[in-house]
């Protein structure tokens, strides 16, 4: 049956046995910076072209044992959910991914820029259809960082991040606090802001929207069929650049501020329990959860 | 994210130096008056303190960067200490990064064409 | 509702060995760093090892260093210690406790279980 | 030898606040996020402070923390009787790799 996540973003009509377009959002190509991936995963194979990119710091600790499937598994959950053959949310997307985490997750902001930057120079050198950057990481606040967010949005760019695990404002966080980037908050199956132990999902007026964020089923490095569920902003962030993927490959003009727009219009509204938040929060979170469009666009999202 | 609303820096740190042009005998010194900003991040854990991207002016060219960045290595040289230029940035943002002692930041910041200069932070898989 | 329940303590001779166990409920268990941390008797809390939600790096105090060595099965939700060459000094409550994230693991630790008492004597 | 130093004891009358001070260096406090925790007696820890000043849910915000340089503090204001426990700090030391409490503050309602 269909996994929770993507019934969630489902418009009520197309919920049939399993999740309907075949061909979503493959006008689009979708940048993953993150960790290494397993490319040769049966989820994803085909789907994500790994670039010769990569800008990590070493990782911590005298005896840390560096497994590949380690290394790969936030990298390689994340493109299944935007494009996985059977738990992606735009199957018909093509990735592109940018090792800027290490085998621990960890990055740097000055790595993530130079992978911003790659990214606007492949944009220069040979320039495609609608371009998509999934940017599931955050650190603390970062002007710089922000910045390059804002220029490469200016350049067309649609930029969506994770809005950051830390139970906290998100204006607090980059790339999520840039005004120019979309920013997701984590919900689960019940519609609650994801709690994540003592931490859970970032608030705040900086985040835009929230997805399915909670027990997320998708590709694991552990072998090339397995499958696992993780949970976090990055996954519900993986959602939206999903689901932005489709909206563009339908209507491939729309601004950033139309898609915007969109995003927020088919949303679910006012579904999420606002007391998990802090009182002065709660005002300022957007109560909205991330949807596909339903029949409107019926033969340019459901090919 | 959330488009409209203005910048929120939270309790990002800003140290602002002032720019003063007397020492090196800059030929491109700036302006009288501009400052360039120093920022860090406000969780310190996750400062990378020794590694600085210098963020230059908007119409900066790649070839006034690599300028720049050569120049502070110089000065620097002078005073005794090494640098190492990591990567200059051209296409979103003009500057570099750079790796070297905190005890320069004072003379970077005083260069031709920086804007501001920022250490270099962690980030995590969310 | 989330749990921790440490088991394995006893009185054990000084030089033998002993295993220690925490099972662990209600939560992800493989999303989360873990750590044992011990108590003396009378004394302050003594860290003693820590380990990643994916068993990918491991950390000890001093005082412990190549003789215990931590562990994790997570398809069992179980933390083990096992502590060899053991000294009267080791004599103490162990608690084993949830790290409050998986990456960031310096942030400390938000759950704890009740503990279990080692006693090393002749 | 714990490398964070707290003092032994501090007490004050219901209602009144107290502050605990743990001091240590640019390698653990100065660099690291500070957590602090409580111990009633008889009982396991528990986590009332992490990241310096942020509370987990169901801690009341009488307890506050705070950071300058290489010192933390914990402060607790409208003392209770409930509050009588042992109180330790805790943080990373990059130097050592390891986790590092501090020597504990016994907290007396008089």
């Known amino acids: 049956s269909i996994p929770w996540n993507l019934e969630r973003i489902t418009p009520p009509r197309y919920r049939a046995d399993e999740y309907q377009p075949p061909d979503g959002g493959s006008l689009v190509e979708v940048y993953l910076l993150d960790t290494s991936i397993q490319s040769d995963h049966r989820e994803i194979e085909g789907r994500v072209m790994v670039t010769d990119f990569e800008n990590v710091p070493e990782e911590d600790g005298t005896r840390f044992h560096r497994q590949a499937s380690k290394c790969d598994s936030h990298g390689t959950h994340l493109a299944g959910v935007v494009s996985g053959r059977d738990a992606g949310v735009a199957k018909g997307a093509s990735m592109r991914s940018l090792r800027v985490l290490n085998c621990q997750g960890k990055g740097t902001v000055s790595g993530t820029l130079i992978g911003l930057e790659f990214i606007r120079k492949s944009q220069l050198v040979q320039p495609v259809g609608p371009l998509v950057v999934l940017l599931p990481l955050a650190g603390g606040y970062s002007r710089v960082l922000n910045a390059a967010c804002q220029r490469l949005a200016r350049a067309g760019v649609v930029l969506v991040t994770a809005a950051g695990n830390f139970r906290d404002d998100a204006c607090l966080y980059s790339p999520a606090s840039a005004p120019e980037v979309i920013t997701v908050g984590a919900t689960n199956a019940q519609d609650q802001p994801v709690t994540l132990g003592t931490l859970g999902t970032n608030f705040g007026r900086c985040v835009d929207l929230f997805a399915p964020g909670e027990d997320i089923i998708g590709a694991s490095s552990d072998c090339s069929t397995c499958f696992v569920s993780q949970s976090g902003t990055s996954q519900a962030a993986a959602h939206v650049a999903g689901i932005a993927a489709m909206m563009l490959s339908a209507e491939p003009e729309l601004t950033l501020a139309e898609l915007r727009q969109r995003l927020i219009h088919f949303s679910a509204k006012d579904v999420i329990n606002e007391a998990w938040f802090p009182e002065d929060q709660r005002v300022l979170t957007p109560n909205l959860v991330a949807a596909l469009p339903p029949s409107t666009h019926e033969n340019l999202y459901f090919q | 994210g959330a488009m409209g609303q203005e910048d929120e820096d939270g309790d990002y740190e800003e140290l602002v130096l002032a720019l003063r042009s007397e020492e090196d005998g800059l030929a491109e010194a700036p302006e009288h008056g501009t400052t360039a900003t120093f920022h860090r991040c406000a969780k310190d854990p996750w400062r990378l303190p020794g590694t600085y991207v210098v963020v230059l002016k908007e119409e900066t060219h790649l070839s006034q960067s690599e300028r720049t960045a050569r120049r502070l290595q110089a000065q620097a040289a002078r005073r005794g200490y090494l640098t190492k230029i990591l990567h200059v940035f051209h296409g979103l943002l003009p500057g570099f990064l750079v790796k070297m002692s905190g005890d320069l930041l004072e003379l970077a910041l005083k260069l031709p064409h920086v804007d501001y200069i920022e250490e270099d932070s962690s980030v995590f898989a969310q | 509702q989330v749990h921790l329940v440490e088991s394995g303590g006893g009185v054990v001779q000084p030089g033998r060995s002993l295993r220690l166990s925490c099972a662990a409920s209600g939560f992800t268990f493989n999303s989360f760093g873990m750590h044992w941390v011990r108590q003396a008797p009378g004394k302050g809390l003594e860290w003693v090892a820590l380990i990643w939600s994916d068993g990918s790096d491991e950390y000890y105090a001093d005082s412990v260093k190549g003789r215990f060595t931590i562990s994790r099965d997570n398809s069992k939700n179980t933390l083990y210690l096992q502590m060899n060459s053991l000294r009267a000094e080791d004599t103490a409550v162990y608690y084993c406790?949830?790290?409050?994230?998986?990456?960031?693991?310096?942030?400390?630790?938000?759950?704890w279980g009740q503990g279990t008492t080692v006693t090393v004597s002749s | 030898q714990s490398v964070l130093t707290q003092p032994p004891s501090v007490s004050a009358a219901p209602g009144q606040k107290v502050t605990i001070s743990c001091s240590g260096s640019?390698?653990?406090?100065?660099?690291?996020?500070v957590s602090w925790y409580q111990q009633l007696p008889g009982t396991a820890p528990k986590l009332l402070i992490y990241d310096y000043n942020k509370r987990p849910s169901g801690i009341p915000d009488r307890f506050s923390g705070s950071k300058s340089g290489t010192s933390a503090t914990l402060g607790i204001t409208g003392l209770q009787t409930g509050d009588e426990a042992d109180y330790y700090c805790g943080t990373w030391d990059s130097s050592l790799s390891a986790y590092v409490f501090g020597t504990g503050t016994r907290v007396t309602v008089l």
């Open positions: 640019s390698s653990n406090i100065g660099n690291n996020f």
């Open positions: 406790a949830r790290a409050i994230a998986a990456l960031y693991y310096y942030y400390g630790m938000d759950v």
